[in-house]
């Protein structure tokens, strides 16, 4: 392992659509992939009238957008579905929205998902 980099071996798993997809609803997911590539965790969620609805959480394949991110933070301004990724075991347990805006100072909206 490279010094200073947290390797991702497992992530929090959640699937709101678990019955249709025939998966578990929640748990811990071991991360697989090519041995030479990095692995990450992700979270996706929706903001329905101020209420946070988690869509999915799990492992994410090698992605430079996720490199060296210890926190799972969505930076895109008002996406339809929020997405963040991070490095480090279970780093997707908490996720937040911190839009990158050019003029106004961004405000953080940390989200700690309630267990289902």
């Amino acid at each position: 392992a490279i010094l200073g980099r947290s390797e991702t071996q497992e992530c929090l798993f959640f699937n709101a659509n678990w019955e249709k997809d025939r998966t578990n609803q929640t748990g811990v997911e071991p991360c697989y992939g090519d041995k030479d590539k990095r692995r990450h965790c992700f979270a996706t969620w929706k903001n329905i009238s101020g209420s946070i609805e988690i869509v999915k959480q799990g492992c994410w394949l090698d992605d430079i957008n996720c490199y060296d991110r210890t926190d799972c933070v969505e930076k895109k301004d008002s996406p339809e579905v929020y997405f963040c990724c991070c490095e480090g075991n279970m780093c997707n347990e908490k996720f937040s929205y911190f839009p990158e805006m050019e003029v106004t100072q961004p405000t953080s909206n940390p989200v700690t998902p309630k267990p289902p």
Partner: antibody, heavy 115, light 111 residues
């Protein structure tokens, strides 16, 4: 092993649309992007766009903006690329590829646009 | 994002080394380690050989290596073999906030 299997060759009339599919197996479909690339006869590779398979978020090359739509069906682990207002210059082999590094590719789908 | 620049063709004899260059700008190739190299044989789909400038994709022989200096990335193939004859493309990572772009391709002939 990772496999991307694309739909068969298509012959289309100018002005019509084509929808190419790309079925993924051997990995968790919702754990990466699917990119679409095309290659005209005797020419180089041209990036068209990408989709985040879990969030559905897309980005398109400026050249194809407004004419291409990339979608993903997570229930069947299949990505789709639809190109509209076809012209003869769109005759090409269309490829899907997994992830931001394009580490695994589909076999390609030849789309011929001819009147 | 403008296309990356590659030489049209390069050639070498079996056993020799060849280097293919891929020139971009200080805002893409120069500042980010996100250049990849693909090999394409006639009538086949491209294959990833090198990603992230210098990392070999699984199963790729160590005769293939990648490097970068300034705004130019390079693919070096040492100990050339007949089966290395193909088209080679450089390209960038695509996904999230990154948009993809490819070089024009380089035809490698093994003499």
């Amino acid at each position: 092993q990772v496999q991307l299997v694309q739909s068969g060759a298509e012959v289309k009339k100018p002005g019509s649309s084509v929808k190419v599919s790309c079925k993924a197996s051997g990995y968790k479909f919702t754990s990466s992007y699917i990119n679409w690339v095309r290659q005209a006869p005797g020419q180089g590779l041209e990036w068209m766009g990408t989709i985040n398979a879990v969030s559905g978020s897309t980005s398109y090359a400026q050249k194809f903006q407004g004419r291409v739509t990339i979608t993903a069906d997570t229930s069947t682990s299949t990505a789709y690329m639809e190109l509209s207002s076809l012209r003869s210059e769109d005759t090409a082999v269309y490829y899907c590829a997994r992830g931001g590094w394009f580490d695994y590719w589909g076999q390609g789908t030849l789309v011929t646009v001819s009147s | 994002q403008s296309a990356l620049t590659q030489p049209r063709s390069v050639s070498g004899s079996p056993g020799q080394s060849v280097t293919i260059s891929c020139t971009g700008t200080s805002s893409d190739v120069g500042s980010k380690n996100y250049v990849n190299w693909y090999q394409q044989h006639p009538g086949k789909a491209p294959k990833l050989m090198i990603y992230g400038v210098s990392k070999r994709h699984s199963g790729v022989p160590d005769r293939f290596s990648g490097s970068k200096s300034g705004n130019t990335a390079s693919l070096t193939i040492s100990g050339l073999q007949a089966e290395d004859e193909a088209d080679y493309y450089c390209g960038t990572f695509a996904g999230g906030k990154y948009y993809g772009v490819f070089g024009g391709g380089t035809k490698l002939t093994v003499l």
